[in-house]
Structure formats: structure tokens, C-alpha cells
């Protein structure tokens, strides 16, 4: 039975040209995390695999940095980076947990972090 909860940074905003950390945290389960995928709707950004380490998609190699931890740092942000990002936690024995983050990249300097929220 899946008892865990994914907590994410929620709805966040950042300035064009800046960077942002995408972070998810899995709690309320003793399941072992074996892989975390960072994805957009139509493509993979990165994978952190317990055995294989990090894989960064070639499309993002120049502006994505692994970490901190199981998170992902997006650099040199453009307005085209606005949209949904998904963290997919592969765990044993629970299965797969998913978290969702919405990032808005702003032209101005009024970018602020939104509230944290949970996805069961």
C-alpha cells in the first residue's frame, strides 16, 4: 500500500536569465527510492538513478545541473521554460509517486516563490 506523500515547491516564479531549484520530497513512507525522474509533459529532463547516477537530457545539458540532493537546478531561464515540471519517484516496494511543480518565468524582477503544497 502506498502511504507516502510528495511535497513540492509548488507554484514558483523566477526571473528570466536567472536560475531556480526544482525540489520534491517524499515523506511518510519507509520505501526505498531507487530512481527519480524530472520530466516535462513531452520530454525527460533528467534522471537520478541509485545505481547509475545522473543522466541529463542532451536538450538540457547546458542549463540543467543535478541537485541539490534529488532536486534539479534550471539555469539561464527563458519565458519558454514556463510550465509544469514533474518529479517521479520510483520506490520499492511502494511503486511510483508523482509531484507537480508549476514554474512561471517572469520578465520583471518581481518573481516570488509560491506556497508549498502537497500532492498525495
Amino acid at each position: 500500500m502506498m502511504t507516502g506523500t510528495i511535497e513540492t515547491t509548488g507554484n514558483i516564479s523566477a526571473e528570466k536569465g536567472g536560475s531556480i531549484i526544482l525540489q520534491c520530497h517524499l515523506s511518510s513512507t519507509t520505501a526505498q527510492v531507487t530512481q527519480v525522474n524530472w520530466e516535462q509533459q513531452d520530454q525527460l529532463l533528467a534522471i537520478c538513478n541509485a545505481d547509475l547516477g545522473w543522466h541529463i537530457s542532451p536538450s538540457f545539458k547546458d542549463r540543467v545541473a543535478p541537485g541539490p540532493g534529488l532536486g534539479l537546478t534550471l539555469q539561464s531561464l527563458t519565458v519558454n521554460d514556463t510550465g509544469e515540471y514533474f518529479c517521479i519517484y520510483h520506490t520499492y516496494p511502494d511503486g511510483t509517486y508523482t509531484g507537480r511543480i508549476f514554474l512561471e518565468v517572469l520578465e520583471s524582477s518581481v518573481a516570488e516563490h509560491g506556497a508549498r503544497f502537497q500532492i498525495p
Epitope: Q35, D42, L44, I47, H55, E84, T96
Partner: antibody, heavy 117, light 107 residues
């Protein structure tokens, strides 16, 4: 339990347009992408495109671009796939499918479209 | 587009046999490969996702492995209900692409 129920088989003439429906139940419709997959008789699987109900975004396979339109009605939890300018090579079973972003845990039963003069 | 080359295209085996089907991606797809089973007249069924994770309810005799460009689906001991066609699929990026399929037949 997740269920995807598709509309029934149809016979169409070359040049015509077909619109297939896929009624979803068992999960929050806006949470998952709906994909469409074509399977010609005796052939393999070909991804056609997707619709993401949360934001209305679509993505199509270039092979079908310009002829395929995927839409959804969030009030009835139903997705649609419209294929125009039908030709004999479009004779196939069409499946709607959903799952985690880009792999498919749940499939419709399939809809056979026959294109014939 | 990422091409998925599956082999063999057909395979004859007996109940109890260990069977291996391979899939090769045209570029590095990390661990983003799924495997499906399809029986005649039915929709495909998900067996494995992310190269090695068995989907809910899939028997433990099915296992997946691989990363990068080379992937394997193994059935450790064939059961009568396993005779079907198997497809690999990359879920790295769109357009999503499938292998041509492997038809597993009774010897």
C-alpha cells in the same frame, strides 16, 4: 478502477473525416495526458499524439500532423481524436491510452476504422 | 526521432522456457523504456516501465533490464498465457516510438 471506453467501429470513404471518442472514468480527468495510438491490421503500434486536459496542450506525431486533431471535453471527461482526409492506409484500430506522462498503464478497447470505397 | 529496433521479430518456445527479447534505441534514452504485451483483438497491457519497474499486478516472471541504448525483457518461465506479441516503447521524448514487436509462439 480506471476505464477508457471508446466509440464503436466505423466505415468511412476516402477523403472523409472520422471522430472517435474516449470516455474516461476512475481518475481525475485533468491529471493525466490522453494519448492516441494507431495499429494497422497485422502491424505494430504508432503514436499519433496527445492532449493534456489540465492546460489544453497538444503534441502530434509529424506523420499525422495536419490531419489529426485531439481535443477533450472536461465537462464529460471525454477525449476525441479526429482524423481527416482519410485514405486506405488509415484503416486501423485506434486506441486511446493514459498513464504516467508518456507510458501507458490504461488503454481503451480500441476502435476499428475501415476506409473503403 | 528515436528508433527502437526490436529482436527477434518472432520466437518459438515451450512452456517453462526462459525467453529474452531485446530492444535497441537509436540514441541514449537512459532508463525510459516500457514493455507491453498484446494478444490478438485486445489492447496492449503494460508490463514494465522505466526499463525495470514491473507494473502493478504483473507476475514476477517478467523482468526488464538495461539502460542507455540496450534493453531486455525476460520471461523466466513461460506460462501458456504468455504467448502473445511484445512491444518495447521509449518514453524519453515525443514522438513516442515503439519497436516493431516480437511474436512469441508455441513451439
Amino acid at each position: 478502477e480506471v476505464q477508457l471506453v471508446q466509440s464503436g467501429a466505423e466505415v468511412k470513404k476516402p477523403g472523409a473525416t472520422v471522430k472517435i471518442s474516449c470516455k474516461v472514468s476512475g481518475y481525475t480527468f485533468t491529471d493525466h495526458t490522453i494519448h492516441w495510438v494507431q495499429q494497422a491490421p497485422g502491424k505494430g503500434l504508432e503514436w499519433m499524439g496527445y492532449f493534456y486536459p489540465r492546460d489544453g496542450s497538444t503534441k502530434y506525431n509529424e506523420k499525422f500532423k495536419g490531419r489529426v486533431t485531439i481535443t477533450a471535453d472536461t465537462s464529460t471527461d471525454t477525449a476525441y481524436m479526429e482524423l481527416s482526409s482519410l485514405r486506405s492506409e488509415d484503416t486501423a484500430v485506434y486506441y486511446c491510452a493514459t498513464g504516467m506522462l508518456r507510458w501507458f498503464a490504461d488503454w481503451g478497447q480500441g476502435t476499428l476504422i475501415t476506409v473503403s470505397v | 526521432d528515436i528508433q527502437m529496433t526490436q529482436s527477434p521479430s518472432s520466437l518459438s518456445a515451450s512452456v517453462g522456457d526462459r525467453v529474452t527479447i531485446t530492444c535497441k534505441a537509436s540514441q541514449d534514452v537512459s532508463t525510459t523504456v516500457a514493455w507491453y504485451q498484446q494478444k490478438p483483438g485486445k489492447a496492449p497491457k503494460l508490463l514494465i516501465y522505466s526499463a525495470s519497474y514491473r507494473y502493478t499486478g504483473v507476475p514476477s516472471r517478467f523482468s526488464g533490464s538495461g539502460s542507455g541504448t540496450d534493453f531486455t525483457l525476460t520471461i523466466s518461465s513461460l506460462q501458456p498465457e504468455d504467448f502473445a506479441t511484445y512491444y518495447c516503447q521509449q518514453h524519453y521524448s515525443t514522438p513516442l516510438t515503439f519497436g516493431a514487436g516480437t511474436k512469441l509462439e508455441l513451439k
